[in-house]
Amino acid sequence: PKQTLPKPIIRAESTYMVPKEKQATLCCQGSYGAVEYQLHFEGSLFAVERPKPPERINGVKFHIPDMNSRKAGRYSCIYRVGELWSERSDLLDLVVTEMYDTPTLSVHPGPEVTSGEKVTFYCRLDTATSMFLLLKEGRSRDVQRSYGKVQAEFPMGPVTTAHRGSYRCFGSYNNYAWSFPSEPVKLLVTGDIENTSLAPTDPTFPDSWDTCLLTRETGLQKDLALWDHTAQNLLR
């Protein structure tokens, strides 16, 4: 069987939701010593990067300027060490936002609720779209989809304090082209405790998986890498 290197990790720097005309940055994290990285878009070669020096860096960044609907879609990457190619990375969905109009987001029965109450978000957009998306800040990968003409409902069921936070919605013209984001709606949920003071919303840390973690190799890392390579050979 043809030997391949482990698949790289593909990430979007800061976010996979990129406003139109802005620059998107994708990171492909492979291996120290990789001489070439290829970015593929919808299955075809899109860009090539060659790290300098290859033995000192474990990945590259691909800059995609002037984001638009033609550049939105599924990306993957591969890398090469010598003549040996890696497996393909997982697919990354890159979305263009700020297309057309801005939806309005509202919440029923209101933005302040008690744990156990049934909550529904409503996203409304008057321009022609049938798919709507609801995202919680700091959880942008957990996209909820709903369908409807002009307006969609997002029933959350009986909420818990884990639902606390800030929400936005988008109208979607296709899977990869979204509207401007709505104004955020902050949902405050108090628990069943007798203390009725409002607990603060969850901190909205940036999504940990939307960060590029490319590192330059130090002497220690090189020793560890050499030890790991030797160990792998011994195991073989």
């Epitope: 509202s106 029923h108 029965p109 209101g110 302040e112 156990g116 409503y122 409304r124 307006q151 007798e194």
Partner: antibody
């Protein structure tokens, strides 16, 4: 502070329609659903329905679906309820109310509607 | 729709008394039970939400309790300004429904 201003009284003929108003101030009008509640003497409150001033979405009590129509005017922060085909059964005090926190915590003074020929 | 029943339509008590008003739901309302006060001039105020939580500005002599289908409002030390009609309301399911009210009078 939060205020919901309603006119004191309306006298209307049987079979006619009436539009009741509720002018809101002291909070973000488009964020909170506006509720309408009916009170007939000795009969307790009945919830008519609610409207989302942000997008015009409504929920009605099935009993009032053909009787009441809820609308808003965002520019003046005013909610309206139109009552049609009035009969003596519609003589009551009608309240607007909002839920800022965990229940209907702010109420208007109520408008007394008398249906009489 | 959930039916809310306040069996006592009127109640007489003396100033300083401890008064309890009860309310029963036709099915479990999961503690989403609120109490309102309507003064003789028609003014309506929220007193208690979620069975036992005191709304801001409401005197601590008011308290609420209950679970499932049975709930009660207690006024621990009746004052003249408490003369009003009291309504329970369930917020568990749409449409919200109210009890018929209990009118509190002074002996």
């Amino acid at each position: 502070q939060v205020q919901l201003q309603q006119p004191g009284a309306e006298l209307v003929r049987p079979g006619a329609s009436v539009r009741l108003s509720c002018k809101a101030s002291g909070y973000t009008f488009t964020t909170y659903w506006m509720h309408w509640v009916k009170l007939r003497p000795g009969q307790g409150f009945e919830w008519i329905g609610e409207i989302n001033p942000g997008n015009g979405g409504t929920n009605y009590n099935e009993k009032f679906k053909r009787k009441a129509t809820l609308t808003v005017d965002k520019s003046s922060s005013t909610a309206y309820m139109q009552l049609s085909s009035l009969t003596s059964e519609d003589s009551a005090v009608y309240y607007c109310a909002i839920r800022l926190r965990f229940a209907l915590d702010y109420w208007g003074q109520g408008t007394s509607v008398t249906v009489s020929s | 729709d959930i039916q809310m029943t306040q069996t006592t339509s009127s109640l007489s008590a003396s100033l300083g008394d401890r008064v309890t008003i009860s309310c029963r739901a036709s099915q479990d309302v999961r503690n989403f039970l609120n109490w309102f006060q309507q003064k003789p001039d028609g003014t309506v105020k929220l007193l208690i939400y979620f069975t036992s939580r005191l709304h801001s500005g409401v005197p601590s002599r008011f308290s609420g309790s209950g679970s499932g289908t049975d709930y009660s409002l207690t006024i621990s030390n009746l004052e003249q300004e408490d003369i009003a009609t009291y309504f329970c309301q369930q917020g568990n399911t749409l449409p919200p429904t109210f009890g018929g009210g209990t009118k509190l009078e002074i002996k």
